[in-house]
Every structure is written in structure tokens, then in C-alpha cells.
């Protein structure tokens, strides 16, 4: 499902219940907020006029959505998942008496919940979890959530600790869905794909709709924007990271020490001053690097380039080039090249292109 | 590119029958809220029903109640129409759309597709 | 139930022109209204939702504002390609729609 994809999220209460003081509402709706701020990086602020990310709106029966509510009992409140417009709203439900207390319906528990909908979870199965589909009382006092409900929320943003997520609001991100997208680098790491553009990177996990937008130097601090090529030796937990002519080791996700270095530790000729893409394939354990018109092959093993290249990749790799963006290796036979806005499936075994894509078509744009 | 294309349309007589398919491609179908709106002809558009991405939560506008049913095959990225006892003033063009939003319909359709003609006339 | 008014129902106008459309309901739906252009024998095509957000790819010629029960969508300087039919919409109810003619 969808994330928000920034760190500073507003609200804003629409209107207010009859049935409580509107201090009561404003401090049950702030509590609620501060419920998940407490376990993720995320920071949110009312704002009193205005379009805030999330609007906190009272209504009874039909209401401007599809699902209207239902009078007293039943459904108590309903949220939409992270989004323009209408995402991330909270809807609750006047004709249920909202209270402070065990009394009514507690608004602060019932917002807790809702608001988990709203920066993006859904229904938990287990009892005692705030995300459990059904309300129940517990004492707002000692209200703790459940590891499930941590687990679920640090799955979408992260711990407190990790400044690791998106950008604030005034740093522009590409549009994914954009049809003329095309990316700086692409590299698997694990189960995910590194999508890397200007300073910015998408990540998507393997056979799931969900992305992410994150700012490169939010992960690493020390790497620059604008990364030119990227490739994964996954048995040895590392990724490199390519820009102008330098390169970054990253270990398990960390920057390693001592870098960068310069690309011509690799073998290259002076002429080369930036690597366009860069590939590593497990099955030879060779990384195949994409230079203008050329490409080298580097023997990881023995840490050196192999004997007759450079060679043109219109010689040797039917169909693609002359130049490409990125590339990476998946499923154990494909390479997927990008050039500009498109994208080529490439079978190493067969030698040939077996589809042609949008580059962003792992997005399910 | 998002694609949805209707089929299914054509002459039917008073109190019958008809089933509308729209294939959808271009987009991952199962999340999203699918609708049906139609418009008769000359006149404005009026929303028909919805669906959500399971397809256990199904809407019908009070002028269809009871007569269409909307379903969804997820695997086969298909949303279907079935339209019983239908009537003259059911005669319209039929347009699949597709809402913004998962979980919860938000009601804002931002890819339709070209439509299917239904007339119905004895 | 919610009920959407839409007015005027047709309008004719000059290449140039600055034309508003208004849209009324009658309950408050907050800022949950969406803006739709029909050409004929053509599909509707999004232009602004949530009541002032321009969809992607959608000049910005094109504006809408308002919120609570009063919106309107305004087209700041005619174009040939703007003479269409418009639509305010809801969750499940549309406006009647306004034909936009050349005058």
C-alpha cells in the first residue's frame, strides 16, 4: 500500500464533536498523532487553515465518500491510506458519543487507530493490536502499542533514530509515473531494486507494489547525488556505487571506510573518466562495465580486468546500446538495460532482448 | 500506459440480460476500486456502481439496485457487469473507471476506458 | 442524501475568454470534489481533485477552488480544444454538466 513519502506531515481538525470540549478533541487527536511519531521519524503538525496531508473531519451518515456511516454502533470511523486529496483523511462518525474516558467511544483510541490507516496500515489479526479491526477499552493512561503495531509502522518508516526517509516537502522528487522517466543507476541489493536519480533513490521490494522515495543522503550521509552506476555482488553483502571517476564500497548497507576511491583501481584506461552502468552476474562472477559505446568485463575474482576488451555492446549484446543508463541483473537469466524512458529484458543465455518496458514499468505505473 | 477496454455492449430486449467485461492492463488491477459509470444518450453522466479490490465490498446506485451486480476477477485483471431485467432507460454508454485509491473508495476516477454501447429496445 | 448543483448548464464563450463554472452542494463534502472533461463520442478525462488540485498533464489554464458546499472551476483563457462539456463530481453523484460552446 501507499507510504507517505516525507517526514513532515500536517493535520488539520475540520470540525468539531458536540459531545467533547474542543480542547479534549485537539489533545485526544495530538495524543493520538504522538502515539506513532514516539516509534517512527515522522513529525506532524496542526495547522488551522489550509490543505494539511490529513484532515480529522466529524460526520454523520453520507459524507462526501462512498462509505457513509451508519448511525450509533457499527462502524465508528473509517481512514484512507496516504495520498492527495481524500488520502490520509480520518473520517469519524458523530452519531457515536465521543468521549475521554471508558464511557462512549474513546476518541483518543479510536484515533490511534485510525491514524495507522492513515500514514498507511492495515488491519491487524492479532487481539491485541491497535490495528485490531474491532474496538476495545483499555486504559488510556497505560495504552502501549503492540510489537505487531510497531512492526507494521518501522516496516513503512523506519525507527525514530533512522533520519532515513523521504524528503521534506520543498525538495522536488521526480515523478514516478512520469512516461519519460529514466534513471542515473539500477541495482538489486538483496530483495530489493535501487532506482537512482538526481539525489534521489526509489526502493522497491521484489514482487510487492509498494515503493519508496528516500533521499541518498539520507541512507548515506557521505555519498553524493547524481550516482552514475551501481552493481551487487550479493554473496559478499556488498554494493558499489559509481560517480564521475570514483567509486563507494558499501558493506551490508554501510558505507565502508577509506572511500572513495578512484575507478582506474579497476584496471581502466585513463580515457575513462565516469562508467555509465554496471553490472555484476554471479553465474560467471564477472561485473560487466558499460562505458559510452564500450563495455569491459572485471574478473572479481582475481580482481582483474579480463584479456580482449574493450568490445562494442552493438556487437555483443544484439539489440541494445549503442549507450545505456543502467542495468541489473535479475532472476538468474536477464539483464534489464535502461537507454532513456525504456527498458529491455535481456536473456544472457539466449543472447537476445525478450520484452521491452517503460522504465518505470516496476512501479506499476 | 493504463488501459481498460469494454466489451459486452449491443441490442438487448426489455427485461433481459446482458454481461459487460472491462480488461484492464497497464496498471496493477488488484488494488484499486473499480466503477461502472454510464451516460444515456445527450445526457450527463451518472455513476452506476463500484467494487473493491477483494471484491467483497460492492456499491450500486439506487437505480440499479437489485438488478446489476458488479464482480471482479483479480487474476484476470477483468471487472464485470452483470445487468438483469433491464430497461429502456437503462440504455447508455457504459464506461469502466478506475479509482485513485485502495481500501477505502475516495470516488475520483482517473483512468476511464472508451465506453460500450447498451441499448435496450423491444 | 448529498446533491450536487452545477450551473450554468451551457455557456458560450470566445477564444480568450476567462469562464467560471460553479458547482454547489448541499451538505458540506469538505474539499472532496473533482472536475471532469467530456468531448464528444470521447471518455471523461480528470482535470482537477480535491477541489483545486490540477491532475498531471492538465494545463494550468485550468484552476478549481473552494471548499465545504461552494467550488468552482475557472478556465483562465479559452482555447480551441477547451469547447467541451464539464462535469463537478462527488463519490457517487456528478453534476448535471455544463456545455461549453463557442460563441
Known amino acids: 500500500g501507499p507510504v507517505w513519502r516525507k517526514h513532515y506531515i500536517t493535520y488539520r481538525i475540520n470540525n468539531y464533536t458536540p459531545d467533547m470540549n474542543r480542547e479534549d478533541v485537539d489533545y485526544a487527536i495530538r495524543k493520538a498523532f504522538q502515539v506513532w511519531s514516539n516509534v517512527t521519524p515522522l513529525k506532524f503538525s496542526k495547522i488551522n487553515t489550509g490543505m494539511a496531508d490529513i484532515l480529522v473531519v466529524f460526520a454523520r451518515g453520507a459524507h462526501g465518500d462512498f462509505h457513509a456511516f451508519d448511525g450509533k454502533g457499527g462502524i465508528l470511523a473509517h481512514a484512507f491510506g496516504p495520498g492527495s486529496g481524500i488520502g490520509g483523511d480520518a473520517h469519524f462518525d458523530e452519531d457515536e458519543f465521543w468521549t475521554t474516558h471508558s464511557g462512549g467511544t474513546n476518541l483518543f483510541l479510536t484515533a490511534v487507530h485510525e491514524i495507522g490507516h492513515s500514514l498507511g496500515l492495515g488491519h491487524s489479526s492479532d487481539p491485541k493490536a491497535v490495528m485490531f479491526p474491532t474496538y476495545k477499552y483499555v486504559d488510556i493512561n497505560t495504552f502501549r502499542l503492540s510489537a505487531d503495531d510497531i512492526r507494521g509502522i518501522q516496516s513503512l518508516y523506519g525507527d525514530p533514530k533512522e533520519n532515513q526517509r523521504l524528503p521534506n516537502p520543498d525538495n522536488s522528487e521526480p515523478a514516478l509515473c512520469d512516461p519519460n522517466l529514466s534513471f542515473d543507476a539500477v541495482t538489486t541489493v538483496g530483495n530489493k531494486i535501487f532506482f537512482f536519480k538526481d539525489r534521489f533513490f526509489w526502493l522497491k521490494v521484489s514482487e510487492r507494489p509498494k515503493t519508496s522515495v528516500n533521499l541518498i543522503s539520507s541512507l548515506w550521509p557521505t555519498l553524493p547525488s547524481g550516482i552514475e552506476a551501481a552493481y551487487e555482488i550479493e554473496a559478499r553483502n556488498q554494493v558499489f556505487l559509481f560517480k564521475d571517476d570514483k567509486y563507494w564500497l558499501i558493506s551490508n548497507l554501510r558505507p565502508e571506510p577509506n572511500y572513495p576511491k578512484s575507478i582506474h583501481s579497476f584496471g581502466f584506461p585513463n580515457f575513462v573518466k565516469k562508467i555509465d552502468a554496471a553490472v555484476f552476474n554471479p553465474r560467471f562472477y564477472r561485473t560487466y562495465f558499460f562505458v559510452d559505446n564500450q563495455y569491459w568485463r572485471y574478473d572479481e575474482r582475481r580482481q582483474m580486468m579480463d584479456p580482449g576488451y574493450p568490445k562494442l555492446i552493438t556487437k555483443n549484446f544484439q539489440g541494445i546500446g549503442p549507450k545505456i543508463d543502467a542495468v541489473f541483473y535479475s532472476k538468474n537469466k536477464y539483464y534489464y538495460f535502461f537507454q532513456g524512458s525504456n527498458q529491455f529484458e535481456y536473456d544472457f543465455l539466449l543472447q537476445r532482448i525478450t520484452k521491452t518496458l517503460k522504465s518505470n514499468s516496476w512501479f506499476g505505473c | 500506459e493504463v488501459q481498460l477496454l469494454e466489451s459486452g455492449g449491443g441490442l438487448v430486449q426489455p427485461g433481459g440480460s446482458l454481461r459487460l467485461s472491462c480488461a484492464a492492463s497497464g496498471f496493477t488491477f488488484s488494488p484499486y476500486w473499480m466503477h461502472w459509470v454510464r451516460q444515456a444518450p445527450g445526457k450527463g453522466l451518472e455513476w452506476v456502481s463500484g467494487i473493491g479490490p477483494s471484491g467483497g465490498l460492492t456499491f450500486y446506485a439506487d437505480s440499479v439496485k437489485g438488478r446489476f451486480t458488479i464482480s471482479r476477477d483479480n487474476s484476470k485483471n477483468t471487472l464485470y457487469l452483470q445487468m438483469n431485467s433491464l430497461r429502456a432507460e437503462d440504455t447508455a454508454v457504459y464506461y469502466c473507471?478506475?479509482?485513485?485509491?485502495?481500501?477505502?473508495?475516495?470516488?475520483?476516477?482517473?483512468?476511464w476506458g472508451r465506453g460500450t454501447l447498451v441499448t435496450v429496445s423491444s | 442524501d448529498i446533491q450536487m448543483t452545477q450551473s450554468p448548464s451551457s455557456l458560450s464563450a470566445s477564444v480568450g475568454d476567462r469562464v467560471t463554472i460553479t458547482c454547489r452542494a448541499n451538505q458540506s463534502i469538505y474539499t472532496y470534489l473533482n472536475w471532469y472533461q467530456q468531448k464528444p463520442g470521447k471518455a471523461p478525462e480528470l482535470l482537477i481533485y480535491?477541489?483545486?488540485s490540477l491532475q498531471s498533464g492538465v494545463p494550468s489554464r485550468f484552476s478549481g477552488s473552494g471548499s465545504g458546499t461552494d467550488f468552482t472551476l475557472t478556465i483562465s483563457s479559452l482555447q480551441p480544444e477547451d469547447f467541451a462539456t464539464y462535469y463537478c463530481q462527488q463519490a457517487g453523484i456528478f453534476g448535471q454538466g455544463t456545455k461549453l460552446e463557442i460563441k
Open positions: 480535491a477541489a483545486s
Open positions: 473507471a478506475k479509482d485513485i485509491r485502495g481500501a477505502y473508495s475516495s470516488g475520483l476516477f482517473d483512468h
